[in-house]
Structures are given as structure tokens and as C-alpha cells.
Interface confidence: medium
């Protein structure tokens, strides 16, 4: 067993590790979410630029200083283009999120065009249809009971939009949608200890060809892709959606990272690689947005004044546009966008951010030199709740995102989508589908706490992403019933 004196020898301060678990006992035992544990570690050493911690037995560096973060994520990105998540590249492993730096470059060059404004405008009508169906469903349910568990409810909307926009699938029956959701839920919630194993023995999963994803999930995405490939006769259909891009890549047979342009760094587009991208788009497009919207609705229920301002803005914009929600009206709603940003400040979904040094690297402004392959971690949650950057951080306040306020803050004080070249490729898609749905909800309903609303909402310890423990229960009151 490696000894826990790595950081002491290098004069880097940090919390005392525990045998076997390092500093991650609570997350390894699933008592606390990893993001919450990282926030606690961030808060332990308020004067330090970096903190030496141990993920299980592996030494890692938790970076607190915003200037150092800027170097890692932007200025010295070449050194930190890897996320440092190593497991089998088979079975969904070579997806865009988890891919090493080279694979990511090859794929990222191809997938970035999916999310241009033009493509998003084309997808908007599909999102719109999904949102209308969703509102119809909520209205019908409302007649029976006005209380909803909005997190799992909103997953039905985001599942529809990602299925329609990325894969051209229409989940006609709620039953089909629920079946798909139940399978996909397993990825996010089934406690796999493979990640802890990787922390203890970096590279072991890769060597043993182990995946972190359940077989049932792998099979679901394989059959999903096989069906779509068959439907489109293996060729792009002209829809210009995610699946068409995949089919173009399939015809090419390989993609090259333009860093070298040589076949040495090309990636063969096998059906396995295709499944891996389908998987990451599905997960990224569905869970993150559903969780963000659920938290936003929660905060609106608890902050009726803010909700009133939002409803007034929605009503005004809809009135000026003949009651229609368009791609442009969503962008126009300034306060709505600020409320969305504030939601992501309080509930950044992907925690912590992680990078791996591809060579030895001196941390700017310190004497610390980290060795090649060291994992560097950043806690968005720690930063977002740091009173140094945000006054009264536990209070939901969209005005923090007034242009002047944003201008006063360090560019790295807000990290819900990561930062730099390897930030979230789908952030504009996520914002659009979320704000469209919230607009539709607020145009029809007022959100109020129910008798079961948890006012001290905890983070679910079992999920890999940040999410509400026990869901979020609120009442949706049809606005025609509200004077």
C-alpha cells in the first residue's frame, strides 16, 4: 500500500488521510456525494492555492486559486487535455467525455458543428413539440393531484428532446419512454466501485479491460444504434442530427485529430465507438438538464418574488410574440437566463472537474511541481459557495448575473460547464431545452411548495452527478386558478 506522505514531502498542505480511503471515505462508502466531499475539502484550507489530497491511495491536487485554474483549463490546456479517467475503451469507454486527449481531439472536431446556432434552431421545433406534450401531460395529471416529483417528471421531457434531436426517435408512448429512462437511470445511480478501484490503482481498469458501465446499458445503446443505422440504411438521412454525423463518420471509417494529421493519431470509427458517443449524448442531454430544471423550479417555489418577476417577463415576451415561444424569445428573456445561471451556480451538476497532467508541471505562483500523470481536481461547488466570490452564497439571487456583476468577477469564479477547450460541448443545447420548458411551465403554472417539499434538500450520495436526495416535491397550480 502506498504511503500517505507524498504531499508532506513536497510541503503541500492538506487534510489528514485515512488508511485505504485517503480523503474520500464518505464518498467511497456512499455517505456523501463526491461533489460535496470536494466542497468540504476546498473549505478546509481557505488560505491555500492548492491542497494535497488522496483519492483512495492516489495523491491528487485540489486547486483553489482561480488564476491557477485559468492556467490549467485555458492557458496551459495542452498539458491538461486529458480528464484522466482510465477504463476499458471497449463498452462505451471511448466516449467524448471520458476519452483521452487525442481521442477527444479527433471526436470533438467532428461533433462541435452539431451545436451551431443554425443546427440548434432546426432542433428547436422538436424541443418545442416535446415541451408541449410535456405540458399537456402535467395539465392532465394536475386534475388528479397538483403535487409532483419534478426531478423524475422532467426527465421524461429531456429524454424526449434528446431522443428526438439526437437520434430522430419519437417516444410515442409514455411506456416506451419510461422503459428507456429506467435503463438509463441505472447508469447514473447503480453504485459501481470501479471508479474507486481506478483511484487506488490508476490504469488497472484499462489493463484488465474493465468497464464502469453495466452490461444492460451497453446492450441498450447497441440496439438503439443498430436500429437507427438500419432505419437509415447506414447512410446519413439529411436530418443533420447527431446520428447523421455519426453515420458520416462511419462511412469515413476513421477520424484524425488535427494536432498531427497523421494516421498514428487516427481513431477507427467502429460500431463500439459509435455506441459510446450515443451513450454520452443521451446521458449528457437528459440527466443534467432535468436536474438543473428541477433545482430551478425548487428555488422558484421557495422564492415567490423571483417567480413573480419571471412570470411577468414570460408573459410580456409571449404577448409581444403572439403567444409563441421561439428560439430568439428564449434568448431575449434576460431575467430567465440569469435565474438559470444562478441555479447552476448553486447546483453545478458535474462535480468535481478533473484533469491529468501529461507532463511534469510547475503550479504558477507556487513552488509546487506536480509529476506527469498527477490528477488535478477543481471544485466548482467550493468556488460557487465561496463568500469571497459570492455574497450570501446560499441565497438564490439571479441579480448576481447582471452584466456588471459578472464583469467584476474572475472569469474562473463560475464553472458549471467547465472551462476552456474541453468545456461542455452541449451547453447551449442544455440551456435551450431547459429554458424552453421552464418558459412553458411558467406560462401555465405557478409553482408552490407542497406539504412534502424538503426545505433542507440534501445531495443524493449514490449518484455520480449532483442531484436532489429523494427528488423534489412541489405543487403546480394552473394559473387560471390563481387570481
Amino acid at each position: 500500500m502506498r504511503t500517505f506522505n507524498y504531499w508532506k514531502k513536497r510541503n503541500v498542505r492538506g487534510p489528514e488521510p485515512v488508511v485505504f480511503f485517503g480523503n474520500l471515505k464518505d464518498s467511497a462508502l456512499r455517505k456523501k456525494n463526491m461533489g460535496v466531499v470536494m466542497e468540504e475539502l476546498y473549505n478546509m484550507f481557505p488560505e491555500e492555492k492548492v491542497i494535497g489530497i488522496y483519492r483512495m491511495t492516489s495523491p491528487c491536487l485540489l486547486v483553489r486559486d482561480l488564476d491557477v485554474i485559468k492556467h490549467i483549463m485555458i492557458k496551459d490546456f495542452e498539458v491538461f487535455s486529458d480528464r484522466g479517467v482510465e477504463f476499458s475503451k471497449e463498452g462505451l469507454g471511448s466516449n467524448l467525455f471520458h476519452a483521452d486527449g487525442e481521442t477527444w481531439r479527433a471526436l470533438g472536431n467532428r461533433f462541435t458543428p452539431i451545436f451551431t446556432s443554425g443546427k440548434l434552431k432546426n432542433m428547436f421545433y422538436l424541443m418545442h413539440e416535446g415541451a408541449d406534450n410535456f405540458i399537456d401531460h402535467v395539465s392532465a395529471e394536475c386534475e388528479k393531484n397538483q403535487e409532483f416529483e419534478v426531478h423524475s417528471l422532467l426527465q421524461t421531457y429531456t429524454m424526449s428532446t434528446i431522443a428526438a434531436c439526437a437520434f430522430g426517435i419519437s417516444y410515442d408512448s409514455i411506456g416506451d419512454k419510461v422503459k428507456a429512462l429506467d435503463i438509463v437511470d441505472k447508469i447514473i445511480s447503480e453504485p459501481s466501485y470501479a471508479i474507486e478501484l481506478d483511484m487506488m490503482y490508476p490504469g488497472l481498469l484499462s489493463k484488465l479491460n474493465l468497464s464502469i458501465f453495466p452490461t444492460v446499458v451497453k446492450n441498450f445503446f447497441k440496439s438503439l444504434v443498430d436500429n437507427i443505422v438500419a432505419q437509415r440504411n447506414g447512410k446519413p438521412s439529411g436530418r443533420n442530427d447527431f446520428m447523421d454525423l455519426i453515420l458520416e463518420l462511419r462511412q469515413l471509417g476513421e477520424v484524425t485529430s488535427n494536432k498531427y494529421g497523421s494516421s498514428a493519431s487516427s481513431l477507427e470509427i467502429t460500431d463500439e465507438v459509435i455506441c459510446a458517443q450515443a451513450f454520452v449524448f443521451y446521458i449528457a442531454g437528459y440527466e443534467t438538464s432535468a436536474t438543473t430544471m428541477a433545482y430551478m423550479i425548487y428555488q422558484l417555489a421557495l422564492n415567490p418574488d423571483i417567480q413573480n418577476k419571471l412570470i411577468a417577463e414570460v408573459d410580456e415576451v409571449l404577448k409581444a410574440n403572439d403567444g409563441k415561444v421561439t428560439y430568439d424569445t428564449v434568448k431575449e428573456m434576460k431575467y430567465l437566463n440569469k435565474a438559470f445561471d444562478e441555479t447552476l451556480r448553486m447546483y453545478s451538476i458535474v462535480e468535481p472537474l478533473q484533469r491529468k497532467a501529461t507532463r511534469d508541471y510547475k503550479i504558477p505562483g507556487t513552488d509546487v511541481v506536480i509529476e506527469k500523470d498527477t490528477i488535478v481536481l477543481i471544485s466548482p461547488r467550493g468556488i460557487h459557495y465561496d463568500p469571497k466570490y459570492y455574497d450570501n452564497p446560499k441565497q438564490f439571487n439571479p441579480d448576481r448575473f447582471d452584466a456588471e456583476e459578472v464583469g467584476k468577477r474572475h472569469p474562473c469564479a463560475y464553472l458549471p460547464f467547465g472551462l476552456g477547450q474541453r468545456n461542455c460541448i452541449g451547453m447551449r443545447f442544455g440551456r435551450l431545452q431547459s429554458l424552453l420548458c421552464i418558459t412553458k411551465i411558467l406560462s401555465k403554472f405557478r409553482i408552490e411548495p407542497s406539504k412534502n417539499t424538503d426545505r433542507n434538500l440534501q445531495v443524493e450520495p449514490h449518484r455520480g452527478l449532483i442531484g436532489p436526495k429523494g427528488g423534489i416535491r412541489v405543487n403546480a397550480i394552473p394559473r387560471k386558478l390563481v387570481s
Epitope: E141, D182, I183, N452, K469, G471
Partner: nanobody, 119 residues
Framework: QVQLQESGGGLVQAGGSLTLSCAAS????????MGWFRQAPGKERELVAD????????YYSDSVKGRFTISRDNAKNTVYLEIDSLKPGDTAVYYC????????????WGQGTQVTVSS
């Protein structure tokens, strides 16, 4: 249709513990989550805990946090409610019910099982 059958109720001494079971049959794929409710004489029926089949998401009402534990066995299509440190105030008929994703309208109900706590 989803059929639900509770069992495990009975007469217990205060301070004791009890595990209630609820077996689901029929079209269980229609059910996203199962909730346990209780209704004491002359009182409204109240939700005490709820668990999702697919992701195990758990909800407890404030009144029972810490003493009640809900769990599921997907292979057996059964949900359990373990009650510790029973108090006379826990005397009630306990019902299990099933609901669809997102809604809190429980659409299928069991017959209920009586739990009586004697001091």
C-alpha cells in the same frame, strides 16, 4: 393493473421494531415508485416514505426520518418498510401504493396492514 399486498403488521411493544412487506404483481413495469402511507384513527392518510424501482431514489417525510427505512428487492418485486423504536403514535393502518414517474398521484393501493403499538 398492479396488485399490491401488504404483510407484517401486528401488535408490538413500544420500543420494538417491525418490518412490513409489500409484494407487487401484475403490470409492475407501469410502476415507477412505491410509497408507504399510514392512517391513524380519525386522521388523514399521510405519506411516510417512497422508493423508486429503477434508481432507488428514496424520500422520507420529516416525521419519520431516522426511524423508518424503506428498501426494495427488484427481483422479488417487493418493497419493505422497517420501523425502529416504535411509539404508540405509530399505531395506524399502513398502506403501500404505487405511482408513475414524476407524479405523486398514487394510482394503485394495497388493502393495508394494521400496526398497533402498546405502551
Amino acid at each position: 393493473q398492479v396488485q399490491l399486498q401488504e404483510s407484517g403488521g401486528g401488535l408490538v411493544q413500544a420500543g420494538g421494531s417491525l418490518t412490513l412487506s409489500c409484494a407487487a404483481s401484475g403490470r409492475t413495469s407501469r410502476s415507477y415508485a412505491m410509497g408507504w402511507f399510514r392512517q391513524a384513527p380519525g386522521k388523514e392518510r399521510e405519506l411516510v416514505a417512497d422508493i423508486a424501482w429503477s434508481d432507488g431514489r428514496i424520500y422520507y417525510s420529516d416525521s419519520v426520518k431516522g426511524r423508518f427505512t424503506i428498501s426494495r428487492d427488484n427481483a422479488k418485486n417487493t418493497v419493505y418498510l422497517e420501523i425502529d423504536s416504535l411509539k404508540p403514535g405509530d399505531t395506524a393502518v399502513y398502506y403501500c401504493a404505487s405511482r408513475a414517474r414524476g407524479t405523486v398521484s398514487y394510482n394503485y393501493w394495497g388493502q393495508g396492514t394494521q400496526v398497533t403499538v402498546s405502551s
